[in-house]
Interface confidence: low
């Protein structure tokens, strides 16, 4: 979510308060890993209700991503799995630990394998079927949201080359059984099955066997339905403001969600003289994040002793699973100058990103 | 070292107002939430509220909503609790904590101050 | 809110004996977000467990906690005096933030 390296924009407008997060981890896994992040507490202190993050949305733990409040594992990932991760406070959004993940060779359809698992000589003359990757093959409980893309995996090899198939629920498993069909790559000993449905869910059963013997592993895919909708941002909310320097300045913003939505406050800013990032994104720095456990939040936004530079264009964004809505609105501040600023303490400074 | 620090005890009459005060210091006192938790003569802890000195935010327990107003100044590390109109029912030890670092439990706590009302 | 009721109220008990004290919520308090704490008269509450089952820093090893869900334990395994106080269990996962209403572990 934000920047590799944090800049600061010192002043009223980017108060974040906290220390400024390390800077962000780049990690890569291969496609069908467990993607594992820790995010121990500073010191080695307690450490409690936390909400892992991804691009922005929070991650609704499922069995294949177990959320933990010092550790994250999501487990058979693929190239969705991609993407900016971050440990943050449950109520204040304070990110405790940022991550850039990408997870390598992963096609979403299944399509450009890269043949890892294809059987090798292994130098034995004759043999029954067996398990290259029994790793891999852990994880037998398989949950995901509905629309995803769902690869069961069962590499194998002997000698002759074992040959291998599916059932579903105990009974053959062939394309025509579900609207989308299935890829079956043999090759990669895998069944991809695209853009999963609630009729998807059952025991998924790959049988592989050569005239030496057949072995046979089972999982369970569950499919979870979505929320019916995106956040909702109640029209006219927030609204444009004028204030007088020195004075207080409330903005509401009315969201609705029947997930828990992610609620951020943000301000646009400018780095170094430019108000969009390298790829053309504007620059943004949190004034407050949080996730909201009701499904109809009114948050408010309060500014204190405003300034001229507390001027500008905000934004009220909600995020959840389903995506994000957002409102930009103004502040225009005059009136006389007022008196010179104290210096923001650098504790109280906000993380700006392009956003 | 971290310590919450509370204003002495008060003896007040009912319908009197009353702001007493709990002084965060040896931590970043805008980075984490302050709690307050009242425990009643001989009973047990109920909590009442938390904020958020970095911009005030307040999260009120339902109990205690309209009935006390929590504040805070993070210029002088001060987080305060507030009462309009003060009732012998408020009679009790209030005690200002602090939220640990991922914002759940209480991990430090003031010496608390005595209230009591009476006519 | 979630009620937590806590089990014995008096725990009459000598030292070097072991307690154990029970906490058990009306509902689920969702991933153990639930801490103990010790209090002692005339004095502030004191964190003792968070998570459950986490220790907090500088609580000496015979405290224990366990439990998930809606049943949670205390256990002191060998009372030593300064043990012998109040002991309240606290829900954090779900708000209105709860406590139970405390168990008195007396000298017997």
């Known amino acids: 979510e934000s920047l590799g390296t944090e800049q600061r924009v010192v002043g009223r407008a980017a108060e974040v308060p906290g220390p400024e997060p390390g800077q962000q981890e780049q990690l890569v896994f291969g496609s069908g890993d467990a993607v594992e992040l820790s995010c121990p507490p500073p010191g080695g202190g307690p450490m409690g209700p936390t909400v892992w993050v991804k691009d922005g949305t929070g991650l609704v733990p499922s069995e294949r991503v177990l959320v933990g409040p010092q550790r994250l594992q999501v487990l058979n990932a693929s190239h969705e799995d991609s993407g900016a991760y971050s440990c943050r406070q449950r109520l204040t959004q304070r990110v405790l630990c940022h991550f850039s993940v990408r997870v390598t060779d992963a096609p979403s359809s299944g399509d450009d394998e890269d043949g890892e698992d294809e059987a090798e000589d292994t130098g034995v003359d004759t043999g029954a079927p067996y398990w290259t990757r029994p790793e891999r093959m852990d994880k037998k409980l398989l949950a995901v949201p509905a629309a995803n893309t769902v690869r069961f995996r069962c590499p194998a090899a002997g000698n002759p080359t074992p040959s291998i198939s599916w059932l579903k629920n105990g009974r053959e498993f062939r394309g025509e059984h579900r609207i989308g069909g299935i890829k079956l790559r043999h090759q990669q000993w895998s069944l991809v099955m695209e853009s999963v449905v609630p009729s998807d869910r059952g025991n998924y059963t790959c049988v592989v066997e050569n005239k030496f013997g057949s072995i046979r592993q089972t999982y369970t895919l569950d499919v979870l339905e979505r929320s019916p909708h995106r956040p909702i941002l109640q029209a006219g909310l927030p609204a444009n403001q004028t204030a007088v320097l020195g004075s207080d300045v409330e903005f509401h913003c009315k969201v609705y969600s029947d997930a828990q939505p992610h609620i951020q406050w943000l301000k646009h800013v400018e780095v170094n003289g430019s108000k969009v990032g390298p790829d053309g994104t504007p620059y943004v720095t949190v004034l407050k994040s949080w996730i909201s456990e009701s499904v109809e939040a009114d948050v408010r936004l309060r500014l204190a002793n405003v300034s001229e530079r507390d001027g500008g264009e905000y934004l009220c964004r909600a995020t959840n699973f389903i995506g994000v809505a957002e409102k930009a609105f103004w502040l225009s501040v005059h009136g006389p100058r007022a008196a010179e600023e104290e210096l923001v303490e650098a504790d109280e400074a906000g993380s700006v990103y392009a956003g | 070292e971290v310590q919450l620090v509370q204003s002495g005890a008060e003896v007040k009459k009912p319908g009197e107002s009353l702001k007493i005060s709990c002084k965060g210091s040896g931590y970043s006192f805008t980075s984490y939430w302050i709690a307050w938790v009242r425990q009643m003569p001989g009973k047990g802890l109920e909590w009442m509220g938390i904020i958020y000195p970095g911009d005030s935010d307040t999260r009120y327990s339902p109990s205690f909503q309209g009935q006390v107003t929590m504040s805070a100044d993070k210029s002088i590390r001060i987080a305060y609790l507030q009462w309009s109109s003060l009732k012998a029912s408020d009679t009790a030890m209030y005690y200002c904590?602090?939220?640990?670092?991922?914002?759940?439990?209480?991990?430090?706590w003031g010496q608390g101050t005595l209230v009591t009302v009476s006519s | 809110e979630i009620v937590l009721t806590q089990s014995p109220g008096t725990l009459s008990l000598s030292p070097g004996e072991r307690a154990t004290l029970s906490c058990r919520a009306s509902?689920?308090?969702?991933?153990?977000?639930l801490a103990w704490y010790q209090q002692k008269p005339g004095q502030a509450p004191r964190l003792l467990i968070y998570g459950a089952s986490s220790r907090a820093t500088g609580i000496p090893d015979r405290f224990s906690g366990s439990g998930s869900g809606t049943d949670f334990t205390l256990t002191i395994s060998r009372l030593e005096p300064e043990d012998f106080a109040v002991y309240y269990c606290?829900?954090?996962?779900?708000?209105?933030?709860?406590f139970g209403q405390g168990t008195k572990v007396e000298i017997k």
């Open positions: 606290q829900q954090y996962g779900s708000s209105p933030w709860t």
């Open positions: 904590a602090r939220l640990d670092y991922s914002g759940s439990w209480f991990d430090y």
């Open positions: 509902q689920s308090v969702s991933s153990s977000y």
